[in-house]
Interface confidence: low
Amino acid sequence: MGNSCYNIVATLLLVLNFERTRSLQDPCSNCPAGTFCDNNRNQICSPCPPNSFSSAGGQRTCDICRQCKGVFRTRKECSSTSNAECDCTPGFHCLGAGCSMCEQDCKQGQELTKKGCKDCCFGTFNDQKRGICRPWTNCSLDGKSVLVNGTKERDVVCGPSPADLSPGASSVTPPAPAREPGHSPQIISFFLALTSTALLFLLFFLTLRFSVVKRGRKKLLYIFKQPFMRPVQTTQEEDGCSCRFPEEEEGGCEL
């Protein structure tokens, strides 16, 4: 009984002594953020010198504050407990973690290339002051037609597919209401549109057949080829637009 009581007291004393020696051995653990444990001054907690900070307690040195220089400007001043934060001066925007770089802005309809800001090539657009020119949406991939042509600054606007458009019908189809049982007006108008399209095609082929007899086979081939020829764009090319070739790096900032 007395022996076990002695063991408990001894253990308690050991634990208490260990805690005391630990804090004696490492007084630095008591130094709060904004200070450092100064070895030159008997390990007392000294405040961080100007232009430095410590964001956590128990640090043996303070870190130098980031300096927002050049095209960087100070977004948040450095304090004794937190680093400075930078952003970019007007005309530049941040890149990288913590705004580690500033990149030049361009106008909408342009992208930054190795030779500075260049206009987007025909068939591409950029609606921001940063980033690269992106290709216009290919409406036909979704079975739609181009409603509004694209520009250097704006993407194309896709409308309903040509089959959805009957002569004299509205060019923008409103969203379809919930379907009801029976023949809804939508279904009737759809069949009417389909019939009128079939009639148009029939007329078209009859006219073609007549033109073959009249003008010969060469003309027919020309009519078929023509709609699929790519439009040749000249004015922007001469302006020096930023046409990108497959081997060129995309999006990278040229220093």
Epitope: D63, I64, G70, C88, T89, G96, G98, M101, C102, C253
Partner: antibody, heavy 122, light 106 residues
């Protein structure tokens, strides 16, 4: 093509002064670039000395030259300068002027001059 | 000031070798680190900026990696024209360079 040509180096006695010039061609130094002077003592590594912000409103100096060297620029002459005063033997080095890239203010130098040698000796 | 320590200070290698040079910062510098190559009597040439971005016109055998305090420059297959001295440089707080690593022919 951007070209930077330094001049003004030479032999000078301790305590003496020199003015280094860096003439830029093929590029306007007022176009928002950051510019810097970097030196290299014979057989030693590179040491950044001084810098001037793209808009000329902020200047930077290494502790070793603070109060003795002054960086400036003359946009009309398209030239960057470094005024060296109270020269010491340890300032002996090849001095390069260099340009910070246009699309970044991160302090990397993409164009360098060929350097001008400054020798401080009695 | 922020100190940069390069290792090794010099190394011998053969053409075709893979070479790795490290640069350690005395405190975290995010990705604000560049690498330069310098040949005797010439001005330094920028190879890598922002820790890992390859400067225009620099061969793709050069690559950079790292963030915070530890950075690496790798030459995947050493070419005869790559024998030179390489410097790292931080731009987090003003600018400082490492002491350099000389790459010599074995």
């Amino acid at each position: 093509e951007v070209q930077l040509v330094e001049s003004g180096g030479g032999l000078v006695q301790p305590g003496g002064s020199l003015r280094l010039s860096c003439a830029a061609s093929g590029y306007s130094i007022s176009s928002g670039h950051h510019w810097g002077w970097i030196r290299q003592a014979p057989g030693k590594g590179l040491e950044w000395v001084s810098g001037i912000s793209g808009y000329g409103d902020t200047t930077y100096y290494a502790d070793s030259v603070k109060g003795r060297f002054t960086i400036s620029r003359d946009n009309s002459k398209n030239t960057l300068y470094l005024q060296l005063n109270s020269l010491r033997a340890e300032d002996t080095a090849v001095y390069y002027c260099a340009r910070d890239p246009y699309s970044s203010g991160s302090g990397y130098f993409d164009y360098w001059g060929q350097g001008t040698l400054v020798t401080v000796s009695s | 000031d922020i100190q940069l320590t390069q290792s090794p200070s010099s190394l011998s290698a053969s053409v075709g070798d893979r070479v790795t040079i490290t640069c350690r910062a005395s405190q975290g510098i995010s990705s604000a680190l560049g690498w330069y190559q310098q040949k005797p009597g010439k001005a330094p040439k920028l190879l890598i900026y922002a820790a890992s971005s390859l400067q225009s016109g620099v061969p793709s055998r050069f690559s950079g990696s790292g963030s915070g305090t530890d950075f690496t420059l790798t030459i995947s297959s050493l070419q005869p024209e790559d024998f030179a001295t390489y410097y790292c440089q931080q731009s987090y707080y003003t600018w400082t360079f490492g002491q350099g690593t000389k790459v010599e022919i074995k």
